[in-house]
C-alpha cells in the first residue's frame, strides 16, 4: 500500500460568542484538512477526532464518523468544526477578547487532529498538530492563503 497523506490546511472560520455573567468565551472553530489517497484502490475515512488546546488545557473536542470514501489517486478536502469553551481558570482571556480598544484579538491555539482510514480491513491513523492564531474578538472567515500565515507561532521549548 502507498501512503495516505493528511495535510492540515488551517482555520477556515471562527465564530465567537460571550457570556458576561460567566466570563466565558465560546468559539466555534472550523478547520480544513486535505486527505490524499496515493493508492490504486479506494480508502474509507472512518473518523476524524480533533481537539483544541489553550495554555496546555483542552478547551474543545469533536469527532466525525463515517465521513467519506476517497477514490484511487484522489484527494478530498474536509471541513470539521470544534466547539470550544474558554472559561474559569482561563477567564482572564475574557477581558482580552472583549477589549474594544484593540482591533485584532489573536490567541494561540493548538489544533490536534487524528484521521482514521480503512482499506481491505486494515486501519491506519494519521495525526497532525499545529499552532494557530485565532481571533477571539469577532467572527472571522480566513482565506486559505492566510491560513498558512497563521501557522508561524511555535512555542519555545
Amino acid at each position: 500500500p502507498r501512503s495516505i497523506e493528511v495535510k492540515y490546511i488551517g482555520v477556515k472560520s471562527a465564530y465567537v460568542s460571550y457570556d458576561a455573567e460567566k466570563r466565558t468565551i465560546y468559539l466555534n472553530i472550523t478547520n480544513t484538512l486535505n486527505i490524499t489517497n496515493n493508492n490504486y484502490y479506494s480508502v474509507e475515512v472512518e473518523n476524524i477526532t480533533a481537539q483544541v488546546q489553550f495554555s496546555k488545557t483542552v478547551i474543545g473536542k469533536a469527532r466525525l464518523n463515517n465521513i467519506t470514501n476517497i477514490g484511487p489517486l484522489d484527494m478530498k478536502q474536509i471541513d470539521y468544526t470544534v466547539p470550544t469553551v474558554i472559561a474559569e481558570e482561563m477567564s482572564y482571556m475574557y477581558d482580552f477578547c472583549t477589549l474594544l480598544s484593540i482591533k485584532v484579538h489573536n490567541i494561540v491555539l493548538m489544533m490536534q487532529v487524528t484521521v482514521t482510514t480503512a482499506y481491505f480491513g486494515h486501519s491506519e491513523q494519521i495525526s497532525q498538530e499545529r499552532y494557530q492564531y485565532v481571533d477571539c474578538g469577532r467572527n472571522t472567515t480566513y482565506q486559505l492563503a492566510q491560513s498558512e500565515y497563521l501557522n508561524v507561532l511555535q512555542p519555545q521549548q
Epitope: 455573567e21 460567566k22 466570563r23 495554555s55 496546555k56 488545557t57 474559569e88 481558570e89 482561563m90 477567564s91 482572564y92 482571556m93 475574557y94 477581558d95 482580552f96 494561540v108 512555542p155 519555545q156 521549548q157
Partner: antibody, heavy 118, light 107 residues
Framework: QVQLQQSGTELARPGASVKVSCKAS????????ITWVKQRGGQGLEWIGE????????YYNEKFKDKATLTADKSSSTAYMELRSLTSEDSAVYFC???????????WGQGTTVTVSS | DIQMTQSPASLSASVGETVTITCRAS??????LAWYQQKQGKTPQLLVY???MLAENVPSRFSGSGSGTQFSLKINSLQPEDFGSYYC?????????FGAGTKLELK
C-alpha cells in the same frame, strides 16, 4: 465596591487543621473565581489554588494538593480554605483574592495570619 | 512548571525618575503575565495583566510590555506612593507562578 473580608488570626498546634474564610461582597460571587496565595515572613508570593463557585471546580498547585482544601458557599458568598496536618512551614499570611482567571487576583482580602506553634 | 526570574532584586530611585523592572519566563508564556505592587504590611495590588492591560484604577504612568519569555514593567515619573515591592506572575497554564520580587526603595 468589591470587598473580600478574611477571618482573623489563627494560632494552631502542629498536626492540627485550620479553616480560613473569605467573604466576598460588591460583585456577583459566581462570576469570578477565588484564588488563594501564601506569603511567608514578608517574602515572596506562592499560589495555592483557586475555586470557581459557580461550578465548584477547583484548581490546585500540586505542592498544596495534600495541604489545602478549597470550598465555597454560594448562599453566603464565602470561600473557605482548610489547611491540614499543620507544621511550622505553614506559618504564613494567607490571602484570598477575586480571580480574573489562573490566579490573577484583582481584589484582595486583608490576609489571615496562621501561626503554628507548640 | 514555568519559573519566573525577576530583576533586579532591589532598586533605588528618586521621585520623578523612570524605572524598569524585568521578568523572564523559563518558557514561552505569550502575553500572559501580570504585575503586582505590594507595600510593606499591605495586600498585593494588581497593576497589569495579559502583558499590558492596565487593571482598574491603576495610574497610566505604569505600563507593561513584552511577550514570549521577556517582559518589563515601566513606571514613569515615580511618585512617593510607588515605593514598595513588585512581583510578576505568569497566568499561562497551571500553576501560575510568581517572580521572587523587586524591592523599589527611595534613594
Amino acid at each position: 465596591q468589591v470587598q473580600l473580608q478574611q477571618s482573623g488570626t489563627e494560632l494552631a498546634r502542629p498536626g492540627a487543621s485550620v479553616k480560613v474564610s473569605c467573604k466576598a461582597s460588591g460583585y456577583i460571587f459566581t462570576t469570578y473565581g477565588i484564588t488563594w496565595v501564601k506569603q511567608r515572613g514578608g517574602q515572596g508570593l506562592e499560589w495555592i489554588g483557586e475555586i470557581y463557585p459557580r461550578s465548584d471546580n477547583t484548581y490546585y498547585n500540586e505542592k498544596f494538593k495534600d495541604k489545602a482544601t478549597l470550598t465555597a458557599d454560594k448562599s453566603s458568598s464565602t470561600a473557605y480554605m482548610e489547611l491540614r496536618s499543620l507544621t511550622s512551614e505553614d506559618s504564613a499570611v494567607y490571602f484570598c483574592a477575586r480571580s480574573k482567571g489562573s490566579g490573577t487576583g484583582d481584589y484582595w482580602g486583608q490576609g489571615t495570619t496562621v501561626t503554628v506553634s507548640s | 512548571d514555568i519559573q519566573m526570574t525577576q530583576s533586579p532584586a532591589s532598586l533605588s530611585a528618586s521621585v520623578g525618575e523612570t524605572v524598569t523592572i524585568t521578568c523572564r519566563a523559563s518558557e514561552n508564556i505569550y502575553i500572559y503575565l501580570a504585575w503586582y505592587q505590594q507595600k510593606q504590611g499591605k495586600t498585593p495590588q494588581l497593576l497589569v495583566y495579559n502583558g499590558k492591560m492596565l487593571a482598574e484604577n491603576v495610574p497610566s504612568r505604569f505600563s507593561g510590555s513584552g511577550s514570549g519569555t521577556q517582559f518589563s514593567l515601566k513606571i514613569n515619573s515615580l511618585q512617593p506612593e510607588d515605593f514598595g515591592s513588585y512581583y510578576c506572575q505568569h497566568h499561562y497554564g497551571s500553576p501560575p507562578a510568581f517572580g521572587a520580587g523587586t524591592k523599589l526603595e527611595l534613594k
